[in-house]
């Protein structure tokens, strides 16, 4: 892409973080190695990765897990990718389902969600899981982000 | 991208390849339906892909493995995504966990790692996995590559 | 990427549909939150994306499928992303694999592929899994796309 | 291209004993497990055991402590060592392996049981 002042890379990459709310949205940093191109993409409220310009994003989110089945509900652990634009109601774009593991105390699985879409400007992406007590912060396992075309 | 010349475009798909290495480190090659775009990315000693510009690569590797729960560690098979850039020490870029399967004589498990990432002149990225004898070298199922974007 | 009418943004995300189809073959529909940025790549049969343009091009699928390894054959359930070239004959480029899960009635897992190769004009690409019936249709659990470098 | 070769079946009385061998040739990097698995008539083929790199050695129920699998790495064989044969273990025996991040099949051998 290496574009020109009219056309710059936009392009994040956001770090896990434990936290302690109880929301599914899961939380995001600036930390480690991550990759924030330019004020064009930010991270707010440590949850949402958040565009100025209209255009076809690749975004994905992977999500490392540990749960065990008979210590969780019957349905299985899903990952959303999830969309807010201005004055519309959210959406899902993509979602992973893994059924939880018969390993004790519990089994690791990693989830990989991409795609193309088309972002409006102020779009909002966030990821939500079905329990985030069961992610998997250590280094490297849970990240998200996006690039413009 | 389709970039002039002095723009051009920077990717790489390498296929798998069994190696009597007993390192963790996985081994590639250009065989098959593989991608080399230029000599801006190199595949060097069969392990590493070595860049020549600095900028923001979408970097990504697939791996396929079989593995029994019971003829295994305790750990899950994990799957690392590094990078060594010149002067300074290896680092975990991404990581997947898969728990190993009950099924015999081994479950077969596929993981995919994919991110965006600023590389320095010169940097290497590779894949590191716990078991190299698990992997799966047929047709298509374990993979690495790059993207400049 | 964001290109002049010369090199004009190619990409596209179609989303699963279920089929009456005995064929291997996924069907896909440009419904829901899809994306076909232009006439260069079209979704031809419900089953294909076809691309007007020679070059590189990020090609991925997620599948997300419920099965049980006693309903199901021995052989894991795979997925496979293939190449179908003008002149030539079909070819694997990405294949992943997953045991069946021992959940009762059906365990869900997901499947992501992705990877950077070389296309034709008229060259299309399709998705092909060892058992349809297996595949998760709801909202943004199985999709397939790409985008031109 | 590694291929894998059975023998040592054959028909023997019920009671009896047999050892089949499974040898790998070509050129072999890596092996995760050999093992066995085996198919009678008008049934689907069935887990009979594995031996792993690490030594660990498992069976199916089904004929836990009348068979003894085992190998020699250096000669890239596995054995099954079959006692106390019965006329249900009739079968066509084949040998399975993750070879080179493979899974290789043998053409299988048939062992019969009967008096």
């Known amino acids: 892409m290496q574009k020109g002042d009219q056309n710059p890379q936009i392009a994040a990459h956001v770090i896990s973080e434990a936290s302690s709310k109880t929301t599914s949205v899961l939380q995001w940093a600036e930390k480690g190695y991550y990759t924030m191109s330019n004020n064009l993409v930010t991270l707010e409220n440590g949850k949402q990765l958040t565009v100025k310009r209209q255009g076809l994003y690749y975004i994905y989110a992977q999500v490392t897990f540990c749960s065990n089945r008979e210590a969780s509900s019957q349905a299985p652990f899903i990952a959303s990718l999830c969309l807010k634009s201005p004055g519309r109601f959210e959406r899902i774009l993509l979602r992973a389902a893994n059924t939880h593991s018969s390993a004790k105390p519990c089994g690791q699985q990693s989830i990989h969600l991409g795609g193309v879409f088309e972002l409006q400007p102020g779009a909002s992406v966030f990821v939500n899981v079905t329990d985030p007590s069961q992610v998997s912060h250590g280094t490297g396992f849970t990240s998200f982000g996006l690039l413009k075309l | 991208m389709q970039k002039g010349d002095q723009n051009p475009q920077i990717a790489a798909h390498v296929i798998s390849e069994a190696s009597s290495k007993t390192t963790s480190v996985l081994q590639w090659a250009e065989k098959g339906y593989y991608t080399m775009s230029n000599n801006l990315v190199t595949l060097e000693n069969g392990k590493q892909l070595t860049v020549k510009r600095q900028g923001l690569y979408y970097i990504y590797a697939q791996v396929t493995f079989c593995s029994n729960r019971e003829a295994s560690s305790q750990a899950p098979f994990i799957a690392s995504l590094c990078l060594k850039s010149p002067g300074r020490f290896e680092r975990i870029l991404l990581r997947a966990a898969n728990t190993h399967s009950s099924a015999k004589p081994c479950g077969q498990q596929s993981i995919h790692l994919g991110g965006v990432f600023e590389l320095q002149p010169g940097a290497s990225v590779f894949v590191n996995v716990t078991d190299p004898s698990q992997v799966s070298h047929g047709t298509g199922f374990t993979s690495f590559g790059l993207l400049k974007l | 990427m964001q290109k002049g009418d010369q090199n004009p943004q190619i990409a596209a995300h179609v989303i699963s549909e279920a089929s009456s189809k005995t064929t291997s073959v996924l069907q896909w529909a440009e419904k829901g939150y899809y994306t076909m940025s232009n006439n260069l790549v079209t979704l031809e049969n419900g089953k294909q994306l076809t691309v007007k343009r020679q070059g590189l091009y990020y090609i991925y699928a997620q599948v997300t499928f419920c099965s049980n390894r006693e309903a199901s054959s021995q052989a894991p359930f795979i997925a496979s992303l293939c190449l179908k070239s003008p002149g030539r004959f079909e070819r694997i480029l990405l294949r992943a694999a997953n045991t069946h899960s021992s959940a009762k009635p059906c365990g869900q897992q997901s499947i992501h592929l992705g990877g950077v190769f070389e296309l034709q004009p008229g060259a299309s690409v399709f998705v092909n899994v060892t058992d349809p019936s297996q595949v998760s249709h709801g909202t943004g659990f199985t999709s397939f796309g790409l985008l031109k470098l | 291209e590694v291929q894998l070769v059975e023998s040592g079946g054959g028909l023997v009385q019920p009671g009896g004993s047999l050892r089949l061998s499974c040898a790998a040739s070509?050129?072999?990097?890596?092996?995760?497990?050999m093992g066995w698995f085996r198919q009678a008539p008008g049934k689907e083929r069935e887990w009979i055991s594995t031996?792993?790199?690490?030594?660990?050695?498992y069976y199916a129920d089904s004929v836990k402590g009348r068979f003894t699998i085992s190998a020699d790495n250096s000669k890239n064989t596995a054995y099954l060592q079959m006692n106390s044969l019965k006329p249900e273990d009739t079968a066509v025996y084949y040998c399975a392996a993750w070879l080179n991040g493979g899974n290789r099949w043998g053409q299988g051998t048939l062992v019969t049981v009967s008096s």
């Open positions: 070509g050129r072999i990097f890596s092996t995760y497990f």
């Open positions: 031996v792993y790199s690490n030594g660990h050695t």
